[in-house]
């Protein structure tokens, strides 16, 4: 009669939790049985992020630190079931913690928008397109940002209009701009739960142009036109 190792009740174990669960929350559990009826002790292996602890007797798994989906999901650890007494045989399975995103990253510009310019003087109102993003996971649909000017005083000179969920157009309301840099503040709302807002700045230069590029004295780079 050969002593056999414990047998887990499932091939693997998974649990879905919100990434903002309180420390000490039960996030899942594992179960195994020993063919000889011996008691089983559970342990975790490979908890590299130090997020979890397991009850050695019940197999319940608890969070012991803040969880962060952006660190990678699912988070995978090994669970070990070991006979208590006997030959101390053990079996290994896996516990996968699936972290469901909470909206915890404010919107931001998708790339560096330095170097935006219009040739001065404007012959007609101009516009440029910009893109927003954030670091949250958007299950089943892309981000749906809304855009507005960041302060009321900007509304005399600029307007912002949404193109789609990630892109918007910034347009001048007139042609009477000075030959200088304007910093346009844009408010981006992600419409999440809870909604998060980012205020970003788009620096736009009105400058004299040579062959379609901003003229700069020696030592300054030419900027590229964006409208």
């Amino acid at each position: 009669d050969v002593n056999e190792a414990p047998q887990f009740s499932q091939h693997v174990f998974q649990a879905k939790v919100s990434e903002d669960v309180a420390i000490g929350t039960k996030v899942g559990n594992v179960t195994a049985k020993d063919p000889e009826g011996l008691d089983i002790s559970y342990s975790l292996r490979g908890d590299t992020r130090g997020w979890l602890k397991i009850d050695h007797v019940t197999g319940e798994i608890f969070s012991v630190a803040p969880l962060d989906r952006e660190a990678g999901s699912p988070y995978r650890v090994q669970v070990v079931a070991t006979e208590v007494g006997g030959s101390s045989l053990s079996s290994v399975s896996e516990f996968h913690l699936i972290l469901m995103d909470v909206n915890d990253n404010p919107p931001r510009l998708a790339k560096d928008y330095t170097g935006l310019f219009f040739c001065h003087p404007l012959s007609a109102p101009g516009s440029l397109i910009f893109e927003a993003t954030d670091d949250d996971q958007h299950l089943f649909r892309g981000p749906h940002f809304t855009f507005s000017l960041g302060s009321g005083s900007l509304q005399n000179d600029w307007e912002v209009s949404k193109i789609n969920g990630t892109h918007a157009r910034l347009s001048t309301r007139h042609t009477e701009f000075e030959e200088r840099e304007y910093v346009v503040l844009i408010r981006i709302n992600d419409g999440g739960r809870p909604p998060l807002e980012g205020i970003v700045s788009l620096p736009v230069t009105f400058c004299s142009c040579v062959e379609g590029s901003c003229f700069r004295p020696a030592g300054h780079k030419h900027h590229h036109h964006h409208h």
Epitope: V12, V92, I98
Partner: antibody
Framework: QVQLVQSGAEVKKPGASVKVSCKAS????????MHWMRQAPGQGQEWMGY????????EYNQKFKDRVTMTADKSTSTVYMELSSLRSEDTAVYYC?????????WGQGTLVTVSS | DIQMTQSPSSLSASVGDRVTITCRAS??????LAWYQHKEGKSPKLLLY???VLADGVPSRFSGSGSGTDYTLTISSLQPEDFARYYC?????????FGQGTKLEIK
């Protein structure tokens, strides 16, 4: 990036054995179980079993238990699946796949043809 | 063994259509379910796991729902590259089993 590269196509006679290899790269080989599936012409996918490369623990589908052997060579990050006593109905494309929740990376498949 | 029954076995649809494929397990698999896309001559590609969670790099037009024994894969707006065979698979306990597949064809 993660890659699973399998050995080339094989033609075998009934009663013979075939050994298919699957070389892993781009991740920690011992950290993920490796499964084998097969798909016969006009049929669905069929799970054959898996190996845990860190412990060499294997578990096989009862259907293949007496004929299949899975092994792992940590020094080359390669797993092997050997199927013996081949018959014509073993003609199929054989796949290795890395296990996560489901199979997140698959080999390109190895066609094994059993014909007299 | 847990049987996975997929329906329909084949489906004709047009680009832009919304498509739904269902998968029924012979017993409760508690959302231990994955969906795959398989194109001729290629390896299967993981679309969703845990019934509802999109795998890395999978477009958001794919979504999954369900619990217990009944599960659904939905493609909200079919794209030309979505025409392929789709499989469900449970990983609740061994032996792991697949549905027989749904062939999605251009109408």
């Amino acid at each position: 990036q993660v890659q699973l590269v399998q050995s080339g196509a094989e033609v075998k006679k009934p009663g013979a054995s075939v050994k298919v290899s699957c070389k892993a790269s781009g991740y920690s080989f011992s950290s993920y179980w490796m499964h084998w599936m097969r798909q016969a012409p006009g049929q669905g996918q069929e799970w054959m079993g898996y190996i845990n490369p860190s412990t060499d623990y294997t578990e096989y589908n009862q259907k293949f238990k007496d004929r299949v052997t899975m092994t792992a060579d940590k020094s080359t990050s390669t797993v092997y699946m050997e199927l013996s006593s081949l018959r014509s109905e073993d003609t199929a494309v054989y796949y290795c796949a890395r296990s996560r929740l489901g199979f997140d990376y698959w080999g390109q498949g190895t066609l094994v043809t059993v014909s007299s | 063994d847990i049987q996975m029954t997929q329906s329909p076995s084949s489906l004709s649809a047009s680009v832009g259509d919304r498509v739904t494929i269902t998968c029924r397990a012979s017993e409760n698999i508690d959302s231990y379910l994955a969906w795959y896309q398989h194109k001729e001559g290629k390896s299967p590609k993981l679309l969703l796991y845990a019934a509802t969670v999109l795998a890395d790099g999978v477009p958001s037009r794919f979504s999954g729902s369900g619990s217990g024994t009944d599960y659904t894969l939905t493609i909200s707006s079919l794209q030309p590259e979505d025409f392929a065979r789709y499989y469900c698979q449970h990983y609740y306990r061994t032996p792991l089993t697949f549905g027989q597949g749904t062939k999605l064809e251009i109408k």
